[in-house]
């Protein structure tokens, strides 16, 4: 019966205690994107820095080829910010001629790829119309939420237009996940 | 060997178990800002409410003089929202005369100051161009991510223009961090 | 004294260890909203999907009648994103006639209802002016922070205009909370 005081009655046997410092975690930061081919009708995925500066992966959470690989099943908080910047958006010029138009837009999607499912699953989407008149513009889209993920799942960040992503600073565009 | 069932094999000796309720945590809320001098080329730092209303600090996480002081090393989730509000931005008037212009902007930076490092480190930045025509405008910038912090690190929130920060409500502008 | 190595000296007796997988958690996703009456001077509350797709509730965190019910006292991270979409906002037409005007706006509030306080408490607010000229527009508002909640507290998400909420995809509009 020794040590029993460390196992209060509400603690389930099937969910063993584990040290917080032992949990899979990653924070990835932006790098300059190399143009790559991507599937038609699918937004291109960003690739990331995983070691330098503020970036890290730990406790079996690995980054490889645009994907964060989930090393154990559980509930994860997943987040990303992408900062976009561009010149005057097209729609504004059309608008000036008096013709309302579906605006240009910027979109970020955090996507899950699972072996057991043929289609990628969109976990989070941030999408915004951009109709700036006569100027350079820039703005972030932030996303974050909790998901039940399985060992072997892969996460990536897709964007509507890779050429609009601000890759200049690690604090502007980033991607992370941690086991709760 | 007694008590061994409470120490599953994946648990590392160097990362002791600890009660979640014992972890450093803080949620700070906005207060009216007193104009203070700040370093040239550095955005001014906000100061915060740490006790009243929704605000709290606990478990050795202390707030003092615009800084959250990190009391123990580990991985922290750090977040802030700043709501900005202003009158018509300058650039829109210039634009109306037909001259494209670099737009006004609003920026939030969560900054880390470390004794052992001369320069502050920008952990998170949210920056947005503002070109509103003929109106009062208001909008939030939200930031949040996970960072490996060291005991003694200090965190602050800097903004591009302190006079544009909406300090009227504790739910509009806030800053927090918690050990994972 | 056996098992003592699993109880480091900084661990408080009053805060028992507990398995992370045993903690209350929920991620709710958007559904089509049915028009309902709401209190005068109070923004309408959204209702949510709690079982299908990405949505789940677990460990005694229950969803019912627009509310997430907090099953045990503690510090929770609470978050929501609402994606809004609409046609040209009214203010832009007024502006075109040369009269500056308080802009249309979109607002999200995460609200706490507690039995010990007659007024709902606004935990988080994201509010943004919308003055889009001649176009359809869409954009998200994201919120997230940590709060000390009591057993029996109820959380809901209120919005300024339920008809502007994008209910088309579970990744665009969502609401969640988890015990830290």
């Amino acid at each position: 019966l020794k040590g029993q005081e460390f196992a209060p009655s509400h603690q389930q046997v099937y969910a063993p205690l584990r040290a917080d410092g032992d949990k899979p975690r990653a924070h990835l930061t932006v790098v300059r994107q190399t143009p790559t081919q991507h599937l038609k009708n699918q937004f291109p995925a960003l690739h990331w820095e995983h070691e330098l500066g503020l970036a890290f992966t730990k406790n079996r959470m690995n980054y490889t080829n645009k994907f964060l690989l989930i090393p154990e099943s559980g509930d994860y908080f997943v987040y990303s910010q992408v900062t976009f910047r561009g010149m005057t958006s097209e729609c504004s010029e059309i608008r000036q001629a008096g013709r309302p138009n579906k605006p240009d837009s910027i979109t970020v999607v955090i996507t899950k790829v699972t072996d057991s499912y043929p289609e990628p699953t969109q976990l989070l989407m941030g999408t915004k119309s951009v109709c700036e008149v006569g100027s350079n513009w820039f703005q972030p889209i932030y996303l974050g939420a909790m998901f039940s993920l399985q060992e072997g799942d892969k996460l990536m960040v897709n964007v509507s237009d890779i050429s609009l992503v601000d890759y200049t600073k690690e604090d502007k565009t980033f991607f992370g996940a941690f086991l709760l | 060997l007694k008590g061994q069932e409470f120490a599953p094999s994946h648990q590392q000796v160097y990362a002791p178990l600890r009660a979640d309720g014992d972890k450093p945590r803080a949620h700070l809320t906005v207060v009216r800002q007193t104009p203070t001098q700040h370093l040239k080329n550095q955005f001014p730092a906000l100061h915060w409410e740490h006790e009243l209303g929704l605000a709290f600090t606990k478990n050795r996480m202390n707030y003092t003089n615009k800084f959250l002081l990190i009391p123990e090393s580990g991985d922290y989730f750090v977040y802030s929202q700043v709501t900005f509000r202003g009158m018509t931005s300058e650039c829109s008037e210039i634009r109306q005369a037909g001259r494209p212009n670099k737009p006004d902007s609003i920026t939030v930076v969560i900054t880390k100051v470390t004794d052992s490092y001369p320069e502050p480190t920008q952990l998170l930045m949210g920056t947005k161009s503002v070109c509103e025509v003929g109106s009062n405008w208001f909008q939030p910038i939200y930031l949040g991510a996970m960072f490996s912090l060291q005991e003694g690190d200090k965190l602050m929130v800097n903004v591009s223009d302190i006079s544009l920060v909406d300090y009227t409500k504790e739910d509009k502008t806030f800053f927090g961090a918690f050990l994972l | 004294l056996k098992g003592q190595e699993f109880a480091p000296s900084h661990q408080q007796v009053y805060a028992p260890l507990r398995a992370d997988g045993d903690k209350p958690r929920a991620h709710l996703t958007v559904v089509r909203q049915t028009p309902t009456q709401h209190l005068k001077n109070q923004f309408p509350a959204l209702h949510w999907e709690h079982e299908l797709g990405l949505a789940f509730t677990k460990n005694r965190m229950n969803y019912t009648n627009k509310f997430l019910l907090i099953p045990e006292s503690g510090d929770y991270f609470v978050y929501s994103q609402v994606t809004f979409r609409g046609m040209t906002s009214e203010c832009s037409e007024i502006r075109q006639a040369g009269r500056p005007n308080k802009p249309d706006s979109i607002t999200v509030v995460i609200t706490k209802v507690t039995d010990s306080y007659p007024e709902p408490t606004q935990l988080l607010m994201g509010t943004k002016s919308v003055c889009e000229v001649g176009s359809n527009w869409f954009q998200p508002i994201y919120l997230g922070a940590m709060f000390s909640l009591q057993e029996g507290d109820k959380l809901m998400v209120n919005v300024s205009d339920i008809s502007l909420v994008d209910y088309t995809k579970e990744d665009k509009t969502f609401f969640g909370a988890f015990l830290l």
Epitope: - | - | L39, N62, T64, N65, F67, L69, V113, T114, D115, S116, Y117, P118, E119, P120, G152, K154
Partner: antibody, heavy 116, light 106 residues
């Protein structure tokens, strides 16, 4: 118009179970919390317990916990109180009240006498 | 249980007088409520959260205090204020009331 109306027998025999219903109009009980409070003759107010109607989650005064049950019927917008094994000491005016999320409001009260 | 000690148990004052009632909790509480109860009527909430005036309540009523010591004040007593006043804490289980203060006109 917002109203809380307590109803039930005015006389209950000792050792029997006291049952009262609070019928609500003008608001949805699921948007708030519902309480029962009693006031014995010439005495102060005693909180008996509360229910969170959306979930049915209850909280009771420990001094009454073994005897009190609060339930709700959301379809009828009603909350009920049951107090078992009553004695003369349970003679009181019983009030239902709401709290949380909207201004507090009380019913007008229902006098229940325990007597043989 | 958190005990609420209210004083005085009764008082008599003239119209226009300032009336003060105190309530002491046996341990610190965050939310204090003050109710008014007229004979044969249900209690009516006057003050919540220690110092917030409930909707429709005249501004002559006020509350203050924090932790364990709370005060309820009627700045200028009116004839319609004849009633019994109760404090109540919402922190612990059970929620407990003070024993009441009966206010009469001299």
């Amino acid at each position: 118009q917002v109203q809380l109306q307590e109803s039930g027998p005015g006389l209950v025999r000792p050792s029997q179970t006291l049952s009262l219903t609070c019928t609500v109009s003008g608001f949805d009980i699921q948007d708030t919390y519902m309480h029962w409070v009693r006031q014995r003759p010439g005495r102060g107010l005693e909180w008996m317990g509360r229910i969170e109607p959306a979930s049915g989650h209850t909280k009771y005064n420990p001094s009454l916990k073994s005897r009190v049950t609060i339930t709700r019927d959301t379809s009828k917008n009603q909350v009920s109180l049951r107090l078992s094994s009553v004695t003369a000491a349970d003679t009181a005016v019983y009030y239902c009240a709401r709290s949380g999320g909207m201004p507090d409001m009380w019913g007008q009260g229902s006098l229940v006498t325990v007597s043989s | 249980d958190i005990q609420m000690t209210q004083s005085p148990s009764s008082l008599s004052a003239s119209v226009g007088d300032r009336v003060t009632i105190t309530c002491r909790a046996s341990q610190g509480v965050m939310y204090m409520y003050w109710y008014q109860q007229k004979p044969g009527k249900a209690p009516k909430l006057l003050i919540y959260g220690a110092s917030n005036l409930a909707s429709g309540v005249p501004s002559r009523f006020s509350g203050s205090g924090s932790g364990t010591d709370f005060t309820f004040t009627i700045s200028s007593l009116q004839p319609e204020d004849i009633a019994t006043y109760y404090c109540q804490q919402w922190e612990g289980n059970p929620r407990t009331f003070g024993q009441g203060t009966k206010v009469e006109i001299k």
